[in-house]
């Protein structure tokens, strides 16, 4: 039987079928608090206007309380990532009360019968924290509603249905199937809590898209683009994970959002940065490294609430599994001259050298056609922290647009072949960390001799911190 | 103590019903799901399915859709297994196991086993 | 479904020595550094009872002399120093987010 949310084709079978005749089932919704990290001790049931089992259980009223909220099941039962998720709350707020919102029964439907049974569910947690703040020193402050995939927006309806403001929600993937494009009232948006967090792991703008695409937050943030995650390729879950299917690969993208969550719960000292970025393709050109005016948090649970934002949308790249964190460095490299290029357009690769250690070969990617007697921008990372960076090894291939452009290249060479090599002239990089927001220019090593053919490397040192720029200096920053 | 208490032993002719049935205690029955486990004579051991003890869902292994039927007397902390029209592949011994819902479904805890015979 | 197939399918052990159960499975158990596959011990007239979850975890009250370990699709069971009570019918069992859940086809162990 198929994990919950796939294969695409699935859902998108469940979204266009005539409503089955259903078990009939109790319209229920369990609260099970987690009094032990152990996932298989039973927690204890809470029970509206009983308060009994608060204090058998022992319900810490002072402290927070977190309501994990699952989402749409085709198994009907509780997935592997929720006892993940329970141990790294218990584990990182040792005092929280930790609660599990069981809708299983209202969740394990057909798709669209699983939707609509969202509202009455988010009403049945704003009844439950109704209740609770009758109680002494109880505060809807303290309370953090973390709702994944069809969650997310119970977690929306419950922050609207109660009475007052919930402290923060956070969506891990919400749902996209019925709630893309709808009323804010329909689906989690930036009313329903003092602080809305997303988490976009699996957004497709073609096909059909699991996860919400739009931002529907204070911040949204879209790792790795939103789309395709690292590690979740047909390959990488071929080779690791149970089942090898596209099912899987579904599975891995939407549940990728729950674990860099519980990531940023375990791994406190390795924090993931997002950075603020009007799209991904910006992003990925490496403009958008900046951390001035509260454009870059934390992700997860560590984000900083950012007061008068809406929908502010924010970017990252990150490992293919725990710690998630990655170091990302803008690369400004000017290219002054072509010499002989033709048709080709080159790719870059780049060494990066550090006091810590030293990355790998990384390519530069290319969104944009890269252009000669310009600064062209680019953004690269590596897995490790590399220290202060001391120098880049620089190399370039050149890949023709065409078989015609080769052919002529080729028919070129032929009919002249001691045609002078394929050059480039860069006299310079600009580095700017995205971590610590330090501003490095690397000049090459030899000033005389910064002409670099295919296949070659050229060499560039530190010259000196910052970039010497017309009218800017460089403000210190803070990151939060 | 935590016990599973299944009915006793049935002999049954092709065609008829079978009923068996698992009694809880020690524990709170709904708060834990409960599998059902086929073992032919000789034979491995055999996913059933399981029921939500709580919701009273049942989900079913592709193999036992159709004849088969879990049930619940939350009341009475038991569980069923009904068996419709027998056949005579339908002689094993059932078992039920418990499994928490938020822990790695592993069945910690197996009623005693109840052996039916299907012959004519 | 995933297939689990076991080796050997039975062994002789001689009193105080290793007994060692493979299990194999048809695509990776894994989840996340987790391993969810578990162990199980029949014997003749009775239910199976649990030995070992998540690969390597000892059941409640199982002695120490049992142990799990493997990763992905190759896991193994190990009893050392077997016992005269340890003869019986050992079982592999997965349980992976998705059912549905199955078990292994059995190593019958029996003491020499």
């Known amino acids: 039987s198929p994990t919950p949310f796939g294969p695409e084709g699935q859902l998108a079978d469940e979204l266009h079928k005539p409503k089955a005749i259903q078990t009939e089932v109790k319209p229920s919704v369990r609260f099970n608090l987690r009094t032990s990290k152990d996932p298989e001790h039973e927690g204890c049931y809470l029970s509206l206007g009983h308060s009994q089992p608060l204090e058998d259980c022992g319900f810490n009223m002072t402290a927070k309380t977190f309501f994990i909220i699952h989402g749409w099941t085709m198994s009907g039962i509780f997935e592997n990532w929720l006892h993940k998720l329970v141990s790294a709350l218990h584990t990182r707020e040792k005092d929280a009360n930790v609660v599990v919102v069981d809708w299983l029964p209202l969740a394990h439907q057909l798709y669209t019968d699983a939707v609509n049974n969202t509202r009455v569910v988010g009403h049945s947690i704003a009844r439950m924290l109704d209740w609770l703040q009758e109680k002494d020193d109880f505060s809807l402050g303290n309370v953090h509603l973390i709702g994944y995939s069809l969650g997310a927006h119970v977690a929306g309806y419950a922050g609207n249905f109660v009475k007052g403001t919930v402290g923060r929600i956070t969506g891990l993937d919400p749902a996209g199937p019925m709630f893309e494009g709808a009323d804010i009232h329909k689906r989690l948006s930036p009313d329903d809590a003092d602080f809305v967090d997303v988490l976009h792991t699996y957004t497709r703008s073609f096909g059909l898209s699991i996860g919400i695409q739009m931002p529907v937050g204070h911040i949204d943030i879209y790792p790795n683009g939103g789309d395709f995650q690292p590690g979740c390729g047909l390959n990488d879950v071929l080779g690791s994970m149970a089942y090898g299917t596209i099912t899987e690969v579904v599975k891995c993208e939407h549940e990728r959002a729950v674990h860099l969550f519980v990531d940023s719960l375990v791994n406190q000292d390795k924090p993931s940065f997002a950075f603020q970025c009007t799209d991904s393709n910006r992003f990925k050109k490496g403009i958008c490294l900046s951390c001035r005016k509260n454009r870059c948090n934390s992700i997860g649970y560590n984000a900083k609430k950012m007061r008068n934002k809406r929908n502010s949308k924010m970017y990252l790249k990150t490992r293919a599994g725990m710690p998630f964190r990655v170091y990302h460095y803008q690369m400004k490299i000017h290219v002054f001259s072509y010499k002989n290029m033709g048709e080709i357009e080159p790719t870059f690769y780049v060494t990066l050298y550090g006091t810590n250690a030293d990355s790998q070969t990384l390519p530069l990617e290319i969104v944009e056609r890269i252009e000669q007697n310009a600064t062209n921008t680019f953004l690269v990372y590596t897995e490790e922290d590399l220290g202060d960076l001391l120098k880049i090894q620089l190399t370039w291939e050149g890949a023709s647009q065409s078989w015609y452009n080769l052919w002529k290249e080729l028919r070129s060479y032929l009919s002249q072949p001691h045609n002078p090599g394929r050059e480039l002239n860069i006299r310079r990089i600009r580095v700017k960390s995205g971590e610590t927001q330090r501003k490095l220019t690397f000049c090459a090593e030899d000033p005389e001799n910064t002409s670099i053919s295919p296949g070659r490397e050229l060499w560039f040192r530190k010259c000196r911190d910052g970039w010497r720029m017309k009218n800017e200096t460089s403000p210190t920053v803070e990151l939060p | 103590q935590i016990q599973l208490v299944q009915s006793g032993p049935e002999l049954k002719k092709p065609g008829e019903t079978v009923k068996i049935s698992c009694k809880a205690s020690g524990y709170t029955f709904t708060n834990y799901g409960m599998n059902w486990v086929k073992q032919a004579p000789g034979k491995d051991l055999k996913w059933m399915g399981w029921?939500?003890?709580?919701?009273?869902?049942?989900t079913y292994a592709d193999d036992f859709k159709g004849r088969f039927a879990f049930s619940l007397e939350t009341s009475a902390s038991t569980a069923y297994l009904q068996i419709n029209n027998l056949k005579n592949e339908d002689t094993a011994t059932y078992f039920c196991?418990?499994?928490?819902?938020?822990?790695?479904?592993?069945?910690?805890?197996w009623g005693q086993g109840t052996t039916l015979t299907v012959s004519s | 479904d995933i297939v689990l197939t076991q080796s050997p399918a039975s062994l002789a052990v001689s009193l105080g020595q290793r007994a060692t159960i493979s299990c194999k499975a048809s695509q990776s158990v894994d989840y996340d550094g987790d391993s969810y596959m578990n162990w199980y011990q029949q014997k003749p007239g009775q239910p199976p009872q649990l030995l070992i979850y998540a690969a390597s975890n000892l059941g409640s009250g199982i002695p120490a002399r049992f142990s799990g370990s493997g990763s992905g699709t190759d896991f193994t069971l190990n009893i050392h120093p077997v016992e005269e009570e340890d003869a019986a019918t050992y079982y592999c069992h997965q349980s992976t987010d998705d059912p549905p859940w199955t078990f292994g086809g059995g190593t019958k162990l029996e003491i020499k």
């Open positions: 196991a418990r499994f928490s819902y938020y822990g790695r479904h592993y069945f910690d805890y």
């Open positions: 029921i939500n003890t709580y919701s009273g869902v049942p």
